[in-house]
Structure formats: structure tokens, C-alpha cells
């Protein structure tokens, strides 16, 4: 079975300091899938952030950067200049 595992359950972030979220794929090669990222905020609203290669949800392109590391089987999401409004639970997902 394929599993996407977050590198850290909690990521402390300083305002304005770039932060990186990572998800590791277990059981399969990440290269075979399209990687997606979502954010869940208070009220359980799930918001689309990014889909490979260059598709971003409204308002996310300027401050977020999606990436993959095929050699390490990682999905990566960079928050370039975090602010309080970026707080929430981030989810990586994959599809074909």
C-alpha cells in the first residue's frame, strides 16, 4: 500500500522565516504520481494549495512553492514568508 508520511507532525515556524514541509512516500516511487498539497484551517475547510507542476490555488502562488525530490522520494512544500494566516494543518496527497 502507498503511504504519504509527514516528516514532522508539528512544524514550528517564525514569521517571515522560510519554512519547509516534507512528506515521504512509502511503498512506491513518488515519481509515478502527481503531488498535491492542501491546507485545513479552523472550521475544517480544506483549501487547495498546489498541484504539480505549476498549478496553485488562488492566492498561494506568491508565497508557496511546491517541489519534489525524486531521489529521496519526498514531496516538498516551501512557505516563503510565513505569517499568522498560514497556520493550519497541511496535507500532501497524490494521484495519477
Amino acid at each position: 500500500a502507498i503511504e504519504l508520511v509527514p516528516e514532522h507532525q508539528t512544524v514550528p515556524v517564525s514569521i517571515g522565516v522560510p519554512a519547509t514541509l516534507r512528506c515521504s512516500m512509502k511503498g512506491e516511487a513518488i515519481g509515478n504520481y502527481y503531488i498535491n498539497w492542501y491546507r485545513k484551517t479552523q472550521g475544517n475547510t480544506m483549501t487547495f494549495i498546489y498541484r504539480e507542476k505549476d498549478i496553485y490555488g488562488p492566492g498561494f502562488k506568491d508565497n508557496f512553492q511546491g517541489d519534489i525530490d525524486i531521489a529521496k522520494n519526498l514531496a516538498v512544500l516551501k512557505i516563503l514568508a510565513p505569517s499568522e494566516r498560514d497556520e493550519g494543518s497541511y496535507y500532501c496527497a497524490c494521484d495519477t
Epitope: A29, G31, N32, K53, Q65, I68, D69, T96
Partner: antibody
Framework: QVTLKESGPTLVKPTQTLTLTCTFS??????????VGWIRQPPGKALEWLAL???????IYSPSLKSRLTITKDTSKNQVVLTMTNMDPVDTAAYFC?????????????WGQGTMVTVSS | EIVMTQSPSFLSASVGDRVTFTCRAS??????LAWYQQKPGRAPNLLIY???TLQSGVPSRFSGSGSGTEFTLTISSLLPEDFATYYC????????TFSQGTRLEIK
Amino acid sequence: QVTLKESGPTLVKPTQTLTLTCTFSGFSLTTSGVGVGWIRQPPGKALEWLALILWNDHTIYSPSLKSRLTITKDTSKNQVVLTMTNMDPVDTAAYFCARDKWELRDAFDIWGQGTMVTVSS
Amino acid sequence: EIVMTQSPSFLSASVGDRVTFTCRASQGISRYLAWYQQKPGRAPNLLIYVASTLQSGVPSRFSGSGSGTEFTLTISSLLPEDFATYYCQQLISYPYTFSQGTRLEIK
């Protein structure tokens, strides 16, 4: 073993239509994430990306040549055909077909040997 | 379309040298970049994809790095068979444009 081979005329007259065929083996164009692209290279010059057809029949063309190009596939024959209308001497080039793979994020991992096409009256 | 600029256009080096090619994109392409080697009269050969992932069968003396708009391909110790032309290609936005290439010559 994956192979691709281009075939078509070596000499085309100006204003004529060029038809090139890429015959491949060792993979299927019905497999998710696979495509076949065409690239050309004028003598002594750089590579130019022309067109791509994907496993799901999606086609993409270079904007500068879009009005002149058509790419199609015949999965039963393992062939991809590129047609280019209104040929001009500046279209003289080696034409390559190559396999595109999503797992390599669309890099061309296997190329044909290329076929040289000269446009002259 | 995205313009890929490679420097230098020509590079002279000797067997055993360490050489670096630079490729710049006219806009950010994350790490969606490939490097190819082409020898005269031959088709290009894929060396690296996603900026730094070595293609299967490519010797480890080849390495790639970079993100955004600036990328490098390094050959750690040149062998005679490495003298060829090298191209980068962006893979984020159609058309997937190539650079003009760098010809690596024997000094």
C-alpha cells in the same frame, strides 16, 4: 528494450507538406504518464521542441509552429506521425522523436537516431 | 515562452578537469530542469532530470544542482568521451524549451 525510429522524406520542396513517422517498440502509448515528442535541430544549431502527444490523446504544440503542425498516434501500430505544412528552407533540420515520461517529469529519456530533412527546390 | 540561457557557449578543458555549465531560466521553473549530452551526428542523451536526479546508467561524475532560475551541471573529472555539446531544458511550461547549448572542447 525501448527504441524509436524516425522515417520520412529526406528532401521536400518549399510549400509542400512534410510527413514524418516515429515507429517505436518496448513501451506502449496507452500507459499512463507516457508520451512521444518531436524535436528538431537545424545544422549546427540548438534543439527546438516541436510537439508532444500523450497517452490520453492530449496534444501540445510549440506556439510558433502550432498553425503548421499536427501530431497523431496509432497505438495499434506503435506509431506517432507529425505533419508540418508549408515547408520552407529554414525548416531544414534533423528531426528527432523521443519518449516523454511523467516519472521523469517529462524529460525525454529515449531518443530516435533522427532523420535529416532538407527543404529545397 | 520561457527562454533558457546557457553559458558559456564554448568551453575548453582537459581530461581530468572539473567543469561546470550554467543554465538560467527567464522565469522561475522550480526544479523542473533536465540536462542532455549530444555528440556530433547523434541524438541527445538524458543525463539529469528534476535538476539533480541522475538518469539510470549515467556515471556519477555528472551532477546537477539549482532551483528557481539558476542551475548548474558539473562533471567532476573529465573523460575523453565527455567532450560533446550539453543542453538544458525547462520542463515546467509548454513549450519545453531548450538552451542554445555549450560545446565542450579539448584544450
